[in-house]
Amino acid sequence: KAMHVAQPAVVLANSRGTASFVCEYASPGKATEVRVTVLRQADSQVTEVCAATYMMGNELTFLDDSICTGTSSGNQVNLTIQGLRAMDTGLYICKVELMYPPPYYMGIGNGTQIYVIDPEPCPDSDF
């Protein structure tokens, strides 16, 4: 048994290859430092997509070159993944770690299946 992390089962990326979903965690007490990691599971391989550590009350900050952005509100994190293509379709798992105060506490969501459909190229037009 570990911290419960909830996330939607399915999300469809938009035509620009952007997908957003909410990752919500349930923990008693008040954590002040939280790390959120997005993992992608495909073909039994798990890879880290992005990660951010934030102090409660502050903004969620990913690395400058990250494909993820996000905002936090209480025990809820709104995650956005950009630049997705059809080949990026897969299960995106939200992992939440309470880093401070101790003890360390971790929870992993069941994952959000993100479907990405590459847009059809626009046909040439005379207009």
């Epitope: 911290m3 790390r35 880093m99 401070y100 360390y104």
Partner: antibody
Framework: EVQLVESGGGLVQPGRSLRLSCRGS????????ISWVRQAPGKGLEWLGF??????????DYVASVKGRFTISRDDSKFIAWLQMDSLKTDDTAVYYC?????WGQGTLVTVSS | QPVLTQPPSVSVAPGKTARISCGGN??????VHWYQKKPGQAPVLVIY???DRPSGIPERFSGSNSGNTATLRISRVDAGDEADYYC???????????FGGGTKLTVL
Amino acid sequence: EVQLVESGGGLVQPGRSLRLSCRGSNFNFDDLAISWVRQAPGKGLEWLGFVRSKAYGETTDYVASVKGRFTISRDDSKFIAWLQMDSLKTDDTAVYYCTTFNYWGQGTLVTVSS
Amino acid sequence: QPVLTQPPSVSVAPGKTARISCGGNNIASEAVHWYQKKPGQAPVLVIYYDSDRPSGIPERFSGSNSGNTATLRISRVDAGDEADYYCQVWDRTTDQPVFGGGTKLTVL
């Protein structure tokens, strides 16, 4: 296997100093605050202080009874933390543990006696 | 700073359920953690965040927290459970941990 191992305990005279070391392995040492907790003979657990992680600038905090006498520091590149104890008193005699609260070392005995 | 009050001792017959309380003003608003301490051994985290068990801790250990009392329950107690048990919370005002005084569990 996660490990925290303390060393440096022993017999020391009142007023003298002692430095305890705590070496961590097989966990995210640099992400977590490292605390020192002691247990004097026949007494309960007493938190002494901690050094926070680099995300918090490795800042420290101490219980009032040891503030100014004890200093905690860390070197994440070596996976090690220290407890520097100065001006030791006889009632500092205890087993000293380093801990992340999830994980605890086996403890090292410090005896302050003349 | 919160004061956590534990009974100095609790006795229980083998196979029965031991209940160890930890009292504190509105403790339900805090995350409570429990540690087992055997003589000559390091403390072990047995329950954290009120009711969760770290890996390796038997299901016989459970916790709850409501109102002004958190409780550690140990079902089907055996002689190996004899130890001192400490509750702990994090004081958000001082940003420091606080331990209860400890409870000695004796298996009759």
